[in-house]
């Protein structure tokens, strides 16, 4: 149903990195326009992105109030130049996106490997702990500090010389790992969450290899 | 409801070893790494290590090197830590625990009180 | 290993006082926990990353601090609260807790 010139959206679609979240949709409009409403599950419906001919919308503002909240978004399609126009029901058409939980479903960004630091047989690898969106007392949270135990880290490292790779683990942003003297190392980070059934790995970080400006070498 | 159940005591001679259970249930067990704290009576906390469960891959506290070994048995969903050459500053309650972010909760044992004593 | 000092080691309040805990880290860290340990039980999480309640734990608890100090505040002391509080930092391995402050309620 709805005027005869306008179609619903289709295909929504939730793309979200480190809780930067946009709501895509189908199809590219042709004499129509879209509005988009957000709610948590018990909350009321918030407007975004009015009479917009984008096919997506920038919902991050919106959920990262509670990341661990549900929400679930519609998009409202109305013809173009007379958005007063409904549907035969007496409103315009529009489509649900499936829920969305941020917490749970956000992809994790790649990586970083801030530094690494060798000192003797012993070199310390620390990742970046990338900031997000995400706001506590007028301040932007990092990764861990949304995600604090259930993010941990993979560590993947090799001899510059050899293929065979190592693995080491953190709870914390920080690697503290023992190599043999006179070697160079290169390493990979990975973040991971273990207790999601969804995104749980991040891709791999750029790689970073010792003798590289990136590190500091320390003979003990 | 999620639990975790370890033995109340364990009364142990100097010299020996002892391994220590905690049982969980009520939770997957392999989505959360397991930790263990060490409590001397009157005294405070001390991390001990963790574990993974899903591959077991452990960090340690150096302190604890060779004097703690964690392990887990997936299949009965239970992880252990064991404690060598025991003398009388091993006697202590010693809880596992894990910590869930999302739900802004954690989890203990009720602990084992171990004593070391000929 | 980041040493978590306490103060005070013992702290005797009264119902309704409001009261805080100090907690002093031997260097910086991203933020600080709270645990809760009554006579004979385990330990029970309070707060978390520095000021975030843990589920289930009454309002009159509050955290706050950064870097090196961090406190606990409890707003007006109940009976209930007579325990033993300790912070925790796992920022930095190995994790570390402090010594404890023991609130005796008078």
């Known amino acids: 149903s709805g005027t005869t010139n306008t179609v619903a959206a289709y295909n929504l679609t939730w793309k979200s990195t480190n809780f930067k979240t946009i709501l895509e949709w189908e199809p590219k409009p042709v004499n129509q326009v879209y509005t988009v409403q957000i709610s948590t599950k018990s909350g009321d419906w918030k407007s975004k992105c009015f009479y917009t001919t984008d096919t997506e919308c920038d919902l991050t503002d919106e959920i990262v109030k509670d990341v661990k909240q549900t929400y679930l978004a519609r998009v409202f399609s109305y013809p173009a130049g007379n958005v007063e126009s409904t549907g035969s029901a007496g409103e315009p058409l529009y489509e649900n996106s499936p829920e969305f939980t941020p917490y749970l479903e956000t992809n994790l960004g790649q990586p970083t490997i801030q530094s690494f630091e060798q000192v003797g047989t012993k070199v310390n690898v620390t990742v970046e702990d990338e900031r997000t969106l995400v706001r506590r007392n007028n301040t932007f949270l990092s990764l861990r500090d949304v995600f604090g135990k259930d993010l941990i880290y993979t560590l993947y490292y090799w001899k510059s010389s050899s293929s065979g790779k190592k693995t080491a683990k953190t709870n914390t942003n920080e690697f503290l790992i023992d190599v043999d003297k006179g070697e160079n190392y290169c390493f990979s980070v990975q973040a991971v969450i273990p207790s999601r059934t969804v995104n749980r790995k991040s891709t791999d970080s750029p790689v970073e290899c010792m003798g590289q400006e990136k590190g500091e070498f320390r003979e003990i | 409801q999620v639990q975790l159940q370890q033995p109340g005591a364990e009364l142990v001679k100097p010299g020996a070893s002892v391994k220590l259970s905690c049982k969980t249930s009520g939770y997957t067990f392999t989505s959360y790494w397991m930790h263990w704290v060490k409590q001397r009576p009157g005294q405070g906390l001390e991390w001990i290590g963790e574990?993974?469960?899903?591959?077991?891959?452990?960090n340690y506290n150096q302190k604890f090197k060779g004097k703690a070994t964690l392990t887990v048995d997936k299949s009965s969903s239970t992880a252990y830590m064991q404690l060598s050459s025991l003398t009388s500053e091993d006697s202590a309650v010693y809880y596992c625990t894990y910590y869930v972010n999302y739900y802004a909760m954690d989890y203990w044992g009720q602990g084992t009180s171990v004593t070391v004593s000929s | 290993q980041i040493v978590l000092t306490q103060s005070p080691a013992i702290m005797s309040a009264s119902l309704g006082e409001e009261i805080t805990l100090t907690c002093s880290a031997s260097?910086?860290?991203?933020?600080m926990h709270w645990y809760q340990q009554k006579s004979g039980t385990s330990p029970k999480l309070l707060i978390y990353s520095t000021s975030n309640l843990a589920s289930g734990v009454p309002s009159r608890f509050s955290g706050s601090g950064s870097g090196t100090f961090y406190s606990l505040t409890i707003s007006s002391v109940e009976a209930e609260d007579a325990a033993d509080y300790y912070c925790h930092q796992w920022s930095s391995y190995p994790y570390t807790f402090g010594g404890g402050t023991k609130l005796e309620i008078k």
């Open positions: 574990i993974d469960p899903s591959d077991s891959y452990t």
């Open positions: 260097s910086s860290v991203s933020y």
